[in-house]
């Protein structure tokens, strides 16, 4: 064809506002003299004696120049129609990558500026290599490979089977009919790792213990547990209407909270992170609520229980003053929890 077809809809040619544009008559051989008209307008834009053959030159285009142009040969036969669409060449796309487990990561991108033109993205990646392998041919195991784009989620590609300790270079190239622009990004899985939040958070009262709650949860489904890549957890809790969270770092998948405010509902949430501190903490899980059981077991009610109401009022007053919830120092003959030294101190006192 005498008119190179930019990818995109057939019969459409592209230009940039404020720049000259050369349109090409699609239905004639190269160099054939043609006349040019705007579609629906009989006024001649450029005659066959222009010396430009089958091309139309527009000195400086702007939005009114968008539309359909008709070209005709000397015998009056229509050579064809071409539609001019204006826009901008791509700017460097903005790319970020994240991993929710230790062997896969995904990258998302957005245009650096809106081009107003049909746009596609070419996505690929390779494993970066340590300098010094000058004597060896680059190994096929370093790529590059395409980064498969997610069919369900536009502007996202996923790398499967990445090596946790390796560094990768991502190449996202935005292409439109006026050009291409590339963003390169170097990523280490261990730096971009952010697990999904823990799942299945349950908060239950501990019968007979009015200041305790038992919380339990599971690994996020996206984290394929292996002995080499465990998660650690962070748990936060607070009484209803209390703005400040108290934080503990549990061992394992459960925690007994020993310093709740008796009788009040408590919100609890958990977050996860690689146990060797790679990457960052996950988002918080959805909050789960629990209320400590009311009253001690009958055979555990001590003589000083008469003053308990006053003690509770004091604790609630503390809460209202924005101080984090703290254990009561009142004696408490309940079983010791080895993870709660304050509870032990209280009993010893």
């Amino acid at each position: 064809s005498p008119c190179p077809q930019a990818w995109g809809p057939p019969g459409v040619q592209y230009g940039q506002p404020g720049r000259p544009v050369m349109l090409c008559c699609p239905g004639v051989s190269a160099g054939t003299p043609v006349s040019w008209f705007r579609d629906g307008d009989s006024r001649l834009l450029q005659g066959p004696d222009s010396g430009l053959g089958h091309r139309l030159v527009l000195a400086q285009v702007d939005s009114p120049d968008e539309g359909t142009y008709v070209c005709q040969t000397l015998d009056g036969v229509s050579g064809g129609m071409v539609t001019l669409k204006l826009g901008f060449p791509p700017a460097r796309p903005e790319v970020s990558c994240q991993a929710v487990d230790y062997e896969n990561f995904s990258c998302t991108w957005s245009p650096g500026q809106v081009s107003g033109l049909p746009t596609r993205y070419l996505t690929s990646y390779r494993k970066k290599t340590l300098p010094g392998a000058e004597s060896q041919r680059e190994s096929p195991s370093t790529g590059p490979w395409p980064c498969p784009q997610d069919p369900l989620e536009a502007s996202r590609c996923v790398v499967h089977g990445a090596e946790f300790w390796s560094e990768y270079r991502i190449n996202v190239t935005e292409v439109n009919p006026l050009g291409a622009s590339t963003c390169l990004l170097d990523v280490r899985l261990q730096s971009i790792l952010r697990p999904d939040p823990p799942q299945g958070l349950r908060v239950e009262s501990v019968p007979g213990y009015p200041r305790r709650l038992h919380a339990s949860w599971t690994y996020p489904a996206s984290w394929r547990r292996q002995p080499h890549f465990l998660l650690k957890f962070r748990l936060q809790y607070r009484p209803a209407q209390h703005p400040a969270w108290s934080t503990v770092e549990p061992i394992g998948l459960e925690e007994v909270i020993t310093d709740t405010v008796a009788g009040l509902p408590h919100a609890v949430r958990v977050s996860a992170r690689d146990f060797l501190d790679a990457g960052t903490w996950s988002a918080w899980s959805p909050e789960a609520w629990g209320t400590p059981s009311t009253g001690l077991l009958q055979d555990e009610i001590p003589d000083w229980s008469q003053g308990h109401g006053q003690q509770l009022e004091a604790v609630v007053a503390q809460e209202d003053s924005l101080a984090p919830a703290r254990p009561s120092l009142q004696p408490d003959p309940r079983p010791l929890d080895h993870r709660d030294p304050l509870e032990q101190v209280a009993v010893l006192a």
Epitope: E94, S96, E134, E138, P144, N171, S181, T182
Partner: antibody, heavy 126, light 112 residues
Framework: EVQLLESGGGLVQPGGSLRLSCAAS????????MGWVRQAPGKGLEWVSY????????GYADSVKGRFTISRDNSKNTLYLQMHSLRAEDTAVYYC???????????????????WGQGTMVTVSS | QSALTQPPSASGSPGQSVAISCTGT?????????VSWYQQHPGKAPKLLIY???KRPSGVPDRFSGSKAGNTASLTVSGLQAEDEADYYC???????????FGTGTKVTVLG
């Protein structure tokens, strides 16, 4: 074998032009930053120019800015240095070199030249 | 872009250590961890010894080590050997115009 091979050097008169080429083999050329470094006889290394993998961004030493143009053809695995308005002080061995570079979310950085060509001599003299 | 400052020469006997300094500014050496060191034997192309301040490419002996404090980077060659006699250059990302900058170069002589 990973290799860079420069060509195009020679004798040129002051004010003249020359185009150096660097043919790359043994690695995925289009993924690497590339640069030119020169060394005048008996002198030290001087950083000349640098180009991003896609060719979309370049950098130049002040001493050559406006006179030299770096470019690349990824389909041919070749790096170029077009030199105009040559001066006697441009006389040097010109090395082509590869850099993996480092790219953060905001920009890319020159890192280190890990592979070097054998160099091509450019002599500017009348 | 001014060249980074290196001592013109350094020397040591076989088995000894020699240290070469490379002084720049906060716009190059001090501002980035992209400092590299090269070894060049007469008539040969330079060879990368150290990159990103302290990292050694595969194949480079661990006798070569790099460090940085403020605007000054250093290369230390310990257990000096005859084949270490060469010119040594530091280099840094320059922070402007996608530019790099080399040091003035240091000639290392192995005595005896």
């Amino acid at each position: 074998e990973v290799q860079l091979l420069e060509s195009g050097g020679g004798l040129v008169q002051p004010g003249g032009s020359l185009r150096l080429s660097c043919a790359a083999s043994g690695f995925t050329f289009s993924w690497y930053f590339m640069g030119w470094v020169r060394q005048a006889p008996g002198k030290g290394l001087e950083w000349v120019s640098y180009i991003y993998p896609s060719g979309g961004s370049t950098g130049y030493a002040d001493s050559v800015k406006g006179r030299f143009t770096i470019s690349r053809d990824n389909s041919k695995n070749t790096l170029y240095l077009q030199m105009h308005s040559l001066r006697a002080e441009d006389t040097a061995v010109y090395y082509c070199a590869r850099d993996e570079g480092y790219c953060s979310s905001t920009s890319c950085y020159f890192d280190a030249f890990d592979i070097w060509g054998q160099g091509t001599m450019v002599t500017v003299s009348s | 872009q001014s060249a980074l400052t290196q001592p013109p020469s350094a020397s040591g006997s076989p088995g000894q250590s020699v240290a070469i300094s490379c002084t720049g500014t906060s716009s190059d050496v001090g501002g980035y961890n992209f400092v590299s060191w090269y070894q060049q034997h007469p008539g040969k192309a330079p060879k990368l010894l150290i990159y990103e301040v302290t990292k050694r490419p595969s194949g480079v002996p661990d006798r070569f080590s790099g460090s940085k404090a403020g605007n000054t980077a250093s290369l230390t060659v310990s257990g000096l050997q005859a084949e270490d006699e060469a010119d040594y250059y530091c280099s840094s990302y320059g922070g402007s115009n996608n530019a790099g900058v080399f040091g003035t170069g240091t000639k290392v002589t192995v005595l005896g």
